[in-house]
């Protein structure tokens, strides 16, 4: 039975040209995390494997930095970065947990962080 919950940074906004940290946190389970995938819609951004470390997709290498922890930092944001991002936690023995973050990249300086929320 999957008892864990994923907490994410929720709906967030940031300014064009700036950077943002995408974070998910898996709690309420003793399952071992074996890999975390970060995806934008159907595009793989990065993988963090417990045995092999980080792999950043070549097309994002210049503006994605791993961390902090299992999070991901997006740099030099453009309006095209607006959209859904997913953290996919592969765990043993529980299986897969998925969290969703919606990022809006704004032209102006009215970017504000959204509230945190939990996905059961």
């Amino acid at each position: 039975m999957m008892t864990g919950t994923i907490e994410t940074t929720g709906n967030i906004s940031a300014e064009k040209g700036g950077s943002i940290i995408l974070q998910c946190h898996l709690s309420s389970t003793t399952a071992q995390v074996t890999q975390v995938n970060w995806e934008q819609q159907d595009q793989l951004l990065a993988i963090c494997n417990a045995d092999l470390g980080w792999h950043i997709s070549p097309s994002f290498k210049d503006r994605v930095a791993p961390g902090p922890g299992l999070g991901l930092t997006l740099q030099s944001l453009t309006v095209n970065d607006t959209g859904e991002y997913f953290c996919i936690y592969h765990t043993y023995p529980d299986g897969t947990y998925t969290g969703r973050i919606f990022l809006e990249v704004l032209e102006s300086s009215v970017a504000e962080h959204g509230a945190r929320f939990q996905i059961p």
């Epitope: 003793t30 417990a50 470390g53 950043i56 930095a65 791993p66 961390g67 922890g69 299992l70 930092t73």
Partner: antibody, heavy 117, light 107 residues
């Protein structure tokens, strides 16, 4: 087998600069952060900063900005830390440690720096 | 910055005792808390990652718990080789920070 081999003991004068190294083996240096941690004699651990050799990203503890410079040469599987304008407060053991998202799981043996006139 | 406060500063125990070490964060850090052991003149060693996840090669008498701001490292039946310093560390946000440490000593 993963190993982090640090350069040897350093004795330096106040005002000087030192550059220490951390040679990684047994894994791909481009897939892990290399962090540097300071420990004064009888004291706790203090995070200086980290470098991600995969794309040369760095993160620093604000306290050490201007004091420490972190770099890495992927072809040599080696990370470096340069400390400048040394004072007695910089006398410490400095550790390198790797982190791939799952904790700082391997540590170097430490480099001892003594600043004395 | 996230401040980590460890207590007690020193813990005097007899081999065979079971002990709990505390680490408290100044703000919520979910489960992004790791525990290290450091013996005299040695490098730190990772004991527990992400509050409760075990590390290969670490004896099962070491366990961790907690989430949010309060975390505990438990040692079930302390052995003589366990005496030394214990540090907690957070990877929730930059800059990474360590707690001040707890010294586990023989009574």
């Amino acid at each position: 087998e993963v190993q982090l081999q640090q350069s040897g003991t350093v004795l330096a004068r106040p005002g000087a600069s030192v550059k220490m190294s951390c040679k990684a083996s047994g894994y791909s240096i481009t897939s892990y952060w290399m962090h540097w941690v300071k420990q004064r004699p009888g004291q706790g651990l203090e995070w200086i900063g980290g470098v991600y050799p995969g794309n040369s990203n760095t993160n620093y503890n604000q306290k050490f900005k201007g004091k420490a410079k972190l770099t890495a040469v992927t072809s040599a599987s080696t990370a470096y830390m340069e400390l400048s304008s040394l004072t007695n407060e910089d006398s410490a053991v400095y550790y390198c440690t790797r982190e791939g998202g799952y904790g700082m799981d391997y540590w170097g043996q430490g480099t001892s720096v003594t600043v004395s006139s | 910055d996230v401040v980590l406060t460890q207590s007690p500063a020193t813990l005097s125990v007899t081999p065979g005792d079971s002990v709990s070490l505390s680490c408290r964060a100044s703000q919520t850090i979910s489960n992004n808390l790791h525990w290290f052991q450091q013996k005299s003149h040695e490098s730190p060693r990772l004991l527990i990652k992400y509050s409760s996840q075990s590390i290969s090669g670490i004896p099962s008498r070491f366990s961790g718990s907690g989430s949010g701001t309060d975390f505990t490292l438990s040692i079930n039946s302390v052995e003589t080789e366990d005496f030394g310093m214990y540090f907690c560390q957070q990877s929730y946000s930059w800059p990474y920070t360590f707690g001040g440490g707890t010294k586990l000593e023989i009574k």
